[in-house]
């Protein structure tokens, strides 16, 4: 969470003096150009400055750095490296900042580095190794523990060759780095599916957000390892159905709070196990606002409501009478 | 630290009324469901009720013998949970507990209060 | 309402030998694979801790000589080797349904 300080708290630099020091070593804690300061807060904020790169000099006492708003393109590898480091940053948000790539090693260097947002970039190109440094079978652990990546999915006509679920999931699961990850969003990314393995490699999950996709089914997904889950955000996707599989799952994380609204629920003989569930699980919140979308005859149904005999599916004709 | 804290027992004549009250600290309160256990003198744990979280809109179970006779609330902005108690029978005579519900309530209470004695005698 | 019913009533015991405490429900308690049967130990003077939740995980911060098992209607709770600090009364709980029950208890007590 980000410390609140009363503006007239921050200090600005005035381009004439950035210049003015520029063949000089930076003094010590200086404010960088565009940006303003608060020691008292450790607080940096260069917002909305269509800064092109991360500025050079940094004071040593930052905790809590934005760099929202600007039009950095790429974050190359150590961008946030310095001599000395700056070991105090703790919270960096890249939000909005027009950024396309992230390579490899972006945020090397940043030994306190716990929350990191990139939100609202369109990442066509995420390194594999952006969040671990190096291209190692293990990496050494990652600080992060609150990774935040909604909406990072960039226009279609930028995005490459491949998937880009698996791009993200490239850079999640490298070198096991962030085994220590509490808290990861990943709403808005119109992913289709979440690859089968990202979780189980993700053990100390306290928060997932997955709301705002396009997930269809999570018959292959297993929250079974997830057993510090405290947060499963799956409102306004695709889903058609839960299975008992996932049911069971769910149900037997010892923390677990998990958010539903909005799914196009197709209330036929499929939706039975889900309705007996719902009816009598603690752990979906709003369950009796969840509706059925489909079929046509079952729209806007509340799901708490039905019974075995709405649940239906109509019989599948054998070929010699179906009709084109 | 999770700490709960409960007050307001006393003495009461049989069909008086009594509030208690449970102070919550170290969690955020809204997300839990929070409940009252009663323990009668030298006897067993009884569940009295609970209320639910924000995300299940605060709605209440009760156990048939204090139903239509005591209420379970709860102040969010103070983190607070009251059980207030109307109609009040000797038989009601106990240590009554606050206690929080682990994330998935079907996991039942993790976190208990010391208690309060409630004493309904003439 | 689910009956549990708790034995032995009391169970004298003598430190560093094992100690069982069995609990046994009307009705499966049993929901989508998990048993929601908790075990709760109150010592004198002091209020219910949890020991053993969902039939067979242990509560962080409870020592590992205590384990559940069990699933569906009989449970029973184990300490491999009783310590001093382990005496009070101990109660199984079910949360599989509405209202949530207790069994009676069984006293924990030195020999």
């Known amino acids: 969470s980000s410390p609140t300080s009363s503006a007239s708290s921050f200090s600005s630099s005035a381009p004439f003096l950035a210049s003015a020091v520029s063949a000089q070593p930076p003094l010590p804690d200086q404010c960088p150009a565009l940006c303003e300061c608060s020691e008292a807060a450790r607080t940096v904020k260069c917002v909305n400055r269509n800064l092109t790169e991360v500025p050079t000099d940094l004071p040593a006492y930052v905790r809590n750095l934005f760099l929202t708003g600007n039009q950095l393109a790429v974050l190359p590898a150590g961008a946030f490296a310095r001599r000395p480091p700056l070991a105090e940053l703790a919270a960096l948000n890249l939000s909005g900042s027009r950024l396309d790539e992230v390579r490899a090693g972006a945020f090397e260097h940043l030994p306190s580095l716990r929350q990191l947002d990139l939100s609202h970039n369109p990442l066509a190109d995420l390194s594999p190794f952006a969040f671990s440094g190096s291209n190692a079978s293990v990496s050494a652990p990652s600080p992060l523990v609150e990774l935040i990546l909604n909406h990072i999915v960039p226009p279609e006509d930028e995005r490459q060759n491949r998937s880009f679920e698996g791009m993200v999931v490239a850079a999640l699961l490298a070198g096991r780095a962030l085994q220590g990850l509490r808290r990861l969003e990943l709403a808005s990314n119109h992913f289709l599916y979440l690859p089968r393995d990202v979780l189980a490699q993700l053990p100390s999950l306290r928060h997932l957000d997955l709301s705002n996709n396009s997930l269809v089914s999570l018959t292959y997904v297993s929250f079974r390892n997830l057993t510090h889950l405290e947060s499963l955000h799956l409102e306004d996707n695709a889903l058609k159905v839960l299975h008992n599989g996932t049911l069971a799952e769910l149900q037997g994380l010892p923390h677990i709070r998990v958010f539903l609204d909005n799914n196009p629920w197709v209330c036929d003989c499929h939706m039975a196990d889900m309705v007996t569930w719902l009816k009598e699980t603690e752990v979906v919140q709003g369950k009796d606002r969840l509706t059925c979308a489909y079929p046509e005859k079952m729209r806007n149904r509340v799901l708490l409501e039905l019974n075995s005999a709405d649940l239906d599916c109509d019989p599948i004709l054998p070929p010699s009478l179906q009709t084109s | 630290e999770v700490q709960l804290v409960e007050s307001g027992g006393g003495l009461v004549q049989p069909g008086g009324s009594l509030r208690l009250s449970c102070a919550a600290s170290g969690f955020t309160f809204t997300d839990y469901y929070m409940s009252w256990v009663r323990q009668a003198p030298g006897k067993g744990l009884e569940w009295v009720g609970f209320i639910r979280n924000k995300g299940n809109g605060y709605t209440t179970e009760n156990s048939a013998s204090v139903k239509g006779r005591f209420t379970i609330s709860r102040d969010n902005s103070k983190s607070s949970l009251y059980l207030q108690m109307n109609s009040l029978k000797t038989e009601d005579t106990a240590v009554y507990y606050c206690a929080r519900y682990r994330g998935n309530p079907h996991y039942a209470m993790d976190y208990w209060g010391q208690g309060t004695l409630v004493t309904v005698s003439s | 309402d689910i009956v549990l019913t708790q034995s032995p009533l009391s169970l004298p015991v003598t430190p560093g030998e094992p100690a069982s405490i069995s609990c046994r429900a009307s009705e499966s308690v049993e929901f989508y694979g998990t048993s929601f049967l908790q075990w709760y130990l109150q010592k004198p003077g002091q209020s219910p801790q949890l020991l053993i939740y969902g039939a067979s995980n242990v509560e962080s911060g409870v020592p590992d000589r205590f384990s559940g098992s069990g699933s569906g209607t009989d449970f029973t709770l184990k300490i491999s080797r009783v310590e001093a600090e382990d005496i009070g009364v101990y109660f199984c709980?079910?949360?599989?349904?509405?209202?949530?029950?207790f069994g009676g208890g069984t006293k924990v007590e030195i020999k």
């Open positions: 709980q079910q949360s599989r349904k509405v209202p949530s029950t």
